[in-house]
């Protein structure tokens, strides 16, 4: 059961929580009971375990990857888990911790060495199977900043947001990624309408900046469905 | 800052239904994943049900699962949780928590951050 998978390993010796936002005395809001840890690939909390559902691995933190808790788990169930480290098995790239990336099955290091062609090359694998995820939904794709000494900027290679300079994003384009601009406010966004639809994007969008959401546009209401074109708001 | 206000709690009797609202003032709420927690007297918080920014992933309690159903309303910044069948050991204070997550804000990890105040739900026998 989830349960018995997230909570079958207590975790001693806690770290310290990381800075969030509390609440304020007098405020509808209270501090969080318990923060997420990882502990393998099961999360426990102080008190107990807090899953954060995701539908893709940019909902989850940059330590974390989004994926079912159970092999072959439903597909509708998908919690940000905890990153691989080095030498841990993976099946794509936003497995593997940063600093690494996942070659062969494997999360290895992404040292300063590497040649940009086999950074493509991995690339390509990892696009040219859609299916090689834990749930056989696709994946954005990421590889750690330490490849490069700078970040990357508008157009550069990369394989995960880190990778490029503040206020891009790394997202798809043909059969490699690259660094594009965060979408800024009336600008048109991808809503995806189901799990892993932005598998099958071959130009991705960015996200919406801080403050905004992607969401249809006014005079768009009355359209069909298929044709709502939606854009980054704020609310 | 997300500041949350939970409503629909009672008294009912087990077996019956009941849905709470959670209420989200501030903004982006729909990049939050957001979450239902229970506290029942002399016992630690509980994990409920849970529900990403998006709606395309929901986890549910093995306790509540086939039972409680967890639904968003983006528009209206609102949370859902639909109780059916409801049982005695249900009795607790529902809390709503969003969870701010993902690399957009530069997280290492994705967590409940902000809790409301809670909403007494009284099942009796």
């Known amino acids: 059961t989830l349960n018995s998978v997230l909570n079958s390993n207590a975790i001693k010796n806690l770290p310290p929580p990381l800075g969030g936002a509390a609440g304020h005395p007098g405020s509808a809001v209270s501090a969080a009971p318990g923060i997420l840890y990882p502990g393998g690939n099961k999360y426990q909390t102080i008190d107990n375990y807090q899953p954060y559902p995701c539908a893709e691995d940019e909902e989850c933190g940059t330590d974390e990857y989004c994926a079912s808790p159970t092999r072959g788990g439903d597909a509708g169930v998908q919690i940000c888990l905890a990153c691989r480290k080095r030498r841990k098995r993976c099946m794509r790239h936003a497995m593997c911790c940063p600093g690494n990336y996942c070659k062969n099955g494997i999360c290895v290091s992404s040292d300063q060495n590497h040649f940009r062609g086999e950074i493509e090359e991995t690339i390509t694998e990892s696009f040219g199977n859609d299916h090689s995820t834990l749930d056989g939904y696709s994946r954005r794709t990421t590889l750690s900043s330490k490849m490069y000494h700078t970040k990357g900027q508008e157009g550069s290679v990369c394989l995960r947001s880190s990778d490029c300079a503040s206020g891009l994003c790394c997202a798809r384009h043909f059969w490699s990624k690259i660094c594009k601009p965060v979408l800024k406010e009336g600008q048109v966004c991808t809503k995806h309408r189901r799990k892993g639809s932005h598998g099958l994007e071959i130009f991705q969008r960015c996200y919406c900046g801080e403050g905004l959401s992607c969401r249809i546009q006014k005079d768009h209401h009355q359209a069909s469905n298929s044709s709502r074109l939606h854009t980054c708001q704020r609310h | 800052q997300v500041q949350l206000v939970e409503s629909g709690g009672g008294v009912v009797q087990a077996g019956d239904s009941l849905s709470l609202s959670c209420a989200a003032s501030g903004r982006t709420f729909s990049s939050y994943a957001m979450g239902w927690f229970r506290q029942a007297p002399g016992k630690e918080r509980e994990f409920v049900a849970a529900?990403?920014?998006?709606?395309?992933?929901?986890v549910y309690a093995d306790s509540v699962k086939g039972r409680f159903t967890i639904s968003r309303d983006n528009a209206k910044n609102t949370v859902y949780l639909q109780m059916n069948s409801l049982k005695p050991e249900d009795t607790a204070v529902y809390y709503c928590?969003?969870?701010?997550?993902?690399?957009?804000?530069?997280?290492?990890?994705?967590?409940?951050?902000?809790w409301g105040q809670g909403t007494q739900v009284t099942v009796s026998s």
């Open positions: 529900i990403s920014w998006s709606g395309g992933s929901t």
């Open positions: 928590a969003a969870g701010n997550g993902g690399r957009t804000y530069g997280h290492s990890r994705a967590r409940y951050d902000y």
